[in-house]
Amino acid sequence: TVPPMVNVTRSEASEGNITVTCRASSFYPRNIALTWRQDGVSLSHDTQQWGDVLPDGNGTYQTWVATRICRGEEQRFTCYMEHSGNHSTHPVPS
């Protein structure tokens, strides 16, 4: 088992909103759960966009999940990752 490296980034979206993206990379095996949470509760599927789980060329995999949130509410959102029985939570950078 190779645990993922998780990185959260933010980018400007429409006025008053930002897009936050959570990337998991260099993990094996392929199965992973990656989702955005608000106040600890998972967002619905239709408010998130997922990338495919793709090989990254080193025998490991990468994927991402993104969602759009209101600027100023970043602290309410975290990216939750679960892989091979381990989990971690990652905040939006300020």
Epitope: D39, G40, V41, S42, L43, S44, S88, T89, P91
Partner: antibody, heavy 122, light 112 residues
């Protein structure tokens, strides 16, 4: 389920600050969201704020943003709330409570501390 | 803020009776993830509140099946099918769908 043990009653003067503690045991502290709530005698409850022990991230009820500051000490599995510039309106019982989430399910205040009575009086 | 209004303020009951408590929110309390985070708590004198029902109708662990929750949108109900002495106290509804999270004013269930 675990336990949440809150610090003892406080008698403080107007204008002062008080720091309440909520020591937890029996569960993985860093995986949990912990909220603080206020209840004045004979009244309903108000949610003050939550803190996520894993990152120290917080979200406040705007009514309390200038009044409350939440912190955690993961080494002792303890959550703290500092309440500042106290007035008689802040006299109340303050509770800590642990959220119990499972993805989109779960409960907000599943497990509670016993409460800390804060009395503000000259 | 979402205002949660509970009725009645006081509910006198006889042991063994059915009790029905009402909670109305000032706006729809469906979370952006599609769930309705409406909960019910019971607080007995001198004690911390205890969770009874979460997500409108789900009993929390250890809660007897005489407690049931229902409702949607803005109208919610807690029913106690046969009131026992240990059920007496103040019942609060709570919404966790919109920040700031808010409680109702409470319904006191007492002996008639």
């Amino acid at each position: 389920q675990g336990q949440m043990q809150q610090s003892g009653a406080e008698l403080v003067k107007p204008g002062a600050s008080v720091k309440l503690s909520c020591k937890t045991s029996g569960f993985t502290f860093s995986d949990n969201y912990i909220s603080w709530l206020k209840q004045k005698p004979g009244q309903s409850l108000e949610w003050i704020a939550w803190i996520y022990a894993g990152t120290g991230g917080t979200s406040y009820n705007q009514k309390f943003t200038a009044k409350a500051q939440l912190t955690v000490d993961t080494s002792s599995s303890t959550a703290y709330m500092q309440f500042s510039s106290l007035t008689t309106e802040d006299s109340a019982i303050y509770y800590c409570a642990r959220h119990d989430y499972y993805g989109t399910s779960g409960a907000w205040f599943a497990y509670w501390g016993q409460g800390t009575l804060v009395t503000v009086s000259a | 803020d979402v205002l949660m209004t509970q009725t009645p303020l006081s509910l006198p009951v006889s042991l063994g009776d059915q009790a029905s408590l009402s909670c109305r929110s000032s706006q729809n309390i469906v979370h952006i993830n599609g769930n309705t985070y409406l909960e019910w708590y019971l607080q007995k004198p001198g004690q911390s509140p205890k969770l009874l029902i979460y997500k409108v109708s789900n009993r929390f662990s250890g809660v007897p099946d005489r407690f049931s929750g229902s409702g949607s949108g803005t109208d919610f109900t807690l029913k106690i099918s046969r009131v026992e002495a240990e059920d007496l106290g103040v019942y609060y509804c709570f919404q966790g769908s919109h920040v700031p999270w808010t409680f109702g004013g409470g319904t006191k269930v007492e002996i008639k």
